[in-house]
């Protein structure tokens, strides 16, 4: 039930120490001050697709 610290988060989400939880990066453009948004900036968005095979 309770994720360990810095748990691996699914694509499009990032770990929040503040909330002890993986959080959705989609909220970051509107609310950029969330601590998990720092992790979102380092990873490609969930809808990212490779442009080559």
């Amino acid at each position: 039930e309770q994720a360990p610290g810095n748990a691996p988060c699914s694509s499009g989400s990032s770990w929040s120490a503040d909330l002890d939880k993986c959080m959705d990066c989609a909220s970051c453009p509107a609310r950029p001050h969330s601590d998990f948004c720092l992790g979102c900036a380092a990873a490609p968005p969930a809808h990212f697709r490779m442009l080559w095979p």
């Epitope: 309770q2 002890d20 939880k21 909220s27 609310r31 001050h33 601590d35 720092l38």
Partner: antibody, heavy 123, light 111 residues
Framework: QVSLKESGPGILQPSQTLSLTCSFS??????????VSWIRQPSGKGLEWLAH???????RYNPSLKSRLTISKDTSRNQVFLKITSVDTADTATYYC???????????????WGQGTSVTVSS | DIVLTQSPASLAVSLGQRATISCRAS??????????MHWYQQKPGQPPKLLIK???NLESGVPARFSGSGSGTDFILNIHPVEEEDAATYYC?????????FGGGTKLEIK
């Protein structure tokens, strides 16, 4: 306008189960990022965080009390519940619920608190 | 658990002067870009009221005479100039990791 209000039994005996209800308005616990915590304060003493429930029904507990605590919610009725089993006189306190949700910037402060409900454990 | 130690436990400050309250954490509650420390004011018979979030961000509606600073393990709440309505107990709280804990409180009296 956000508001929260706690309710409980007032007085109960040692070894019984304490059941508390937090009824709130002005926000939805189905909103992504939203959560509600329970905090208690013995008379004249400091604050102790007990448990937190998230919009997606994820839960967190204070490890020192985890075996005795159960937090739950009824999103449609705007209520959060806390049960504490096997209460003792040390559980005598004012119990608060507080909202923790995203503000305009994306901070997650414990920004709104209920007035608290007083609980006395006595034989 | 991260233990938060507030000092002093109580203080008396003359009207218009500066009140300084310290909160020391048993381990860092900051990262390179974030500090997870918050301050509350509580008056008798009332719930705590959020004053400052994330070290230095004033909550909406809180007067500008309140300010917060610090990083790592050492944090400060300043009130200047102190007004009569500031008589209360002040608590620090962190959200760096579980469990979220509070300091023991500092009672401010206005002289």
């Amino acid at each position: 306008q956000v508001s929260l209000k706690e309710s409980g039994p007032g007085i109960l005996q040692p070894s019984q189960t304490l059941s508390l209800t937090c009824s709130f308005s002005g926000f939805s616990l189905s909103t992504s990022g939203m959560g509600v915590s329970w905090i208690r304060q013995p008379s004249g003493k400091g604050l102790e965080w007990l448990a937190h429930i998230y919009w997606d029904d994820d839960k967190r507990y204070n490890p020192s009390l985890k075996s005795r605590l159960t937090i739950s919610k009824d999103t449609s009725r705007n209520q959060v519940f806390l049960k504490i089993t096997s209460v003792d006189t040390a559980d005598t306190a004012t119990y608060y619920c507080a909202r923790r949700g995203p503000d305009y910037y994306g901070y997650y402060p414990m920004d709104y608190w209920g007035q608290g409900t007083s609980v006395t454990v006595s034989s | 658990d991260i233990v938060l130690t507030q000092s002093p436990a109580s203080l008396a400050v003359s009207l218009g002067q500066r009140a300084t309250i310290s909160c020391r954490a048993s381990k860092s509650v900051s990262t390179s870009s974030y500090s997870y420390m918050h301050w509350y004011q509580q008056k008798p018979g009332q719930p705590p009221k959020l004053l400052i979030k994330y070290t230095s961000n004033l909550e909406s509606g809180v007067p500008a005479r309140f300010s917060g600073s610090g990083s790592g393990t050492d944090f400060i709440l300043n009130i200047h100039p102190v007004e009569e309505e500031d008589a209360a107990t002040y608590y620090c709280q962190h959200s760096r990791e579980l469990p979220w804990t509070f300091g023991g409180g500092t009672k401010l009296e206005i002289k």
